[in-house]
């Protein structure tokens, strides 16, 4: 594949990497494959700089990022270990809240209205965020 | 609610060419990639072509390549397939979907002399 | 291309019996697998996505399950209107393929 030097259109870059903000919800499943499909994936925030960058363009509103903990342990979806990795949960999060009435717990992170993380079921059709690296050799095929 | 039609299908010649059309209401259709899917009679289901949400990225069923076009106008919320060299083969009904939630009714394409 | 199987290809059964469909890939496909309803001239309508998610306004007695390269999807307690025929899709990569689809009638 080709390597990527600048971002798609409708992307934002910063540094070094690609972002999408979506304008509608999705559940966290179907934002995932969007992302994957783009040759891209969630949002995965390693920095205190990043994680502002994100809220400012996110703004005050629920938001997937690419963290999940569905098969056990919390884990990104780019392999960025998570033990440790820039964290900026709500206080008492996550908590794989049972309460919902939804069946389950709570397995998908997102940005709360103050861009701080909390842990929520997946099926809730939130707004996200996909993200793809400069400079990483780029999947698609020549277009037809 | 979200809503997909199609229109454009109908009886064309072997060799002939068809643009197919999907309106698309009811979503913010510029976060949703777009696919079409063909059915042909008493058969399966077959992926025809995807488009990003941008309409930057493109892909093809193998058989479909060169003949197929795919294209969007986000400003219109509307997606296309453009049919040429047609073949008896591609006689079926033609879907529209969105991501792979959403699907229309779809088209009935005929292709025969 | 990942070849998407299915079985059975058609099952007969009554109002209340659990039914049980799967669906297998020529190779692994993480949870990126759907199922969806099709009645005869309708649009299809999806049941379950990622596997195991149940999509919203879909009645709780269906279910999916499984992960890589073999899935399930299971009907607890068949209703009238759940008379149809079901197929998965796999979307982890292109081309985007379907299994050939199970149709359930009345016994």
């Known amino acids: 594949g080709s390597e990527r030097t600048c971002c798609p259109v409708n992307w934002v870059e910063h540094e070094r990497s690609c972002y999408w903000f979506s304008r509608s919800g999705k559940a966290w499943a179907d934002a995932d494959n969007y992302c994957r499909l783009e040759d891209a994936h969630l949002v995965v925030v390693t920095s205190w700089e990043e994680q502002k960058f994100v809220q400012h363009h996110i703004g005050p509103v629920n938001t997937w990022m690419g963290l999940h903990d569905q098969n056990g342990p919390w884990k990104w979806v780019d392999g960025t270990d998570y033990e440790t990795g820039f964290k900026n949960w709500r206080p008492e999060q996550p908590d794989d809240w049972y309460g919902h009435g939804l069946g389950g717990g709570e397995d998908c992170a997102h940005f709360t209205d103050d861009g701080r993380w909390n842990d929520d079921v997946c099926q809730r059709p939130y707004r996200w965020v996909c993200e793809t690296e400069l400079d990483k050799a780029s999947q698609e095929p020549p277009l037809l | 609610q979200v809503q997909l039609v199609e229109s454009g299908g109908g009886l064309v010649k072997p060799g002939g060419s068809l643009r197919l059309s999907c309106a698309a209401s009811g979503f913010t259709f510029s976060d949703y990639y777009m696919i079409w899917i063909r059915q042909a009679p008493g058969k399966g289901l077959e992926w025809v072509s995807y488009i990003s949400s941008s309409g930057i990225t493109k892909y093809y069923a193998d058989s479909m390549k060169g003949r197929f076009t795919i294209s969007r106008d986000n400003a219109k919320n509307s997606l296309y397939l453009q049919m040429n060299s047609l073949r008896a083969e591609d006689t079926a009904v033609y879907y529209c979907a969105a991501d792979t939630i959403y699907w229309g009714q779809g088209t009935l394409v005929t292709v025969s002399s | 291309d990942i070849q998407m199987t299915q079985s059975p290809s058609s099952l007969s059964a009554s109002v209340g019996d659990r039914v049980t469909i799967t669906c297998r890939a020529s190779q692994g496909i993480r949870n990126d697998l759907g199922w969806y309803q099709q009645k005869p001239g309708k649009a299809p309508k999806r049941l379950i996505y990622?596997?195991?998610n149940l999509q919203s306004g879909v009645p709780s007695r269906f279910s999916g399950s499984g992960s890589g390269t073999e899935f399930t999807l299971t009907v607890s307690s068949l209703q009238p209107e759940d008379f149809a025929t079901y197929f998965c899709?796999?979307?982890?990569?292109?081309?985007?393929?379907f299994g050939p689809g199970t149709k359930v009638d009345i016994k």
């Open positions: 899709l796999q979307h982890t990569s292109f081309p985007f393929t």
């Open positions: 990622g596997a195991s």
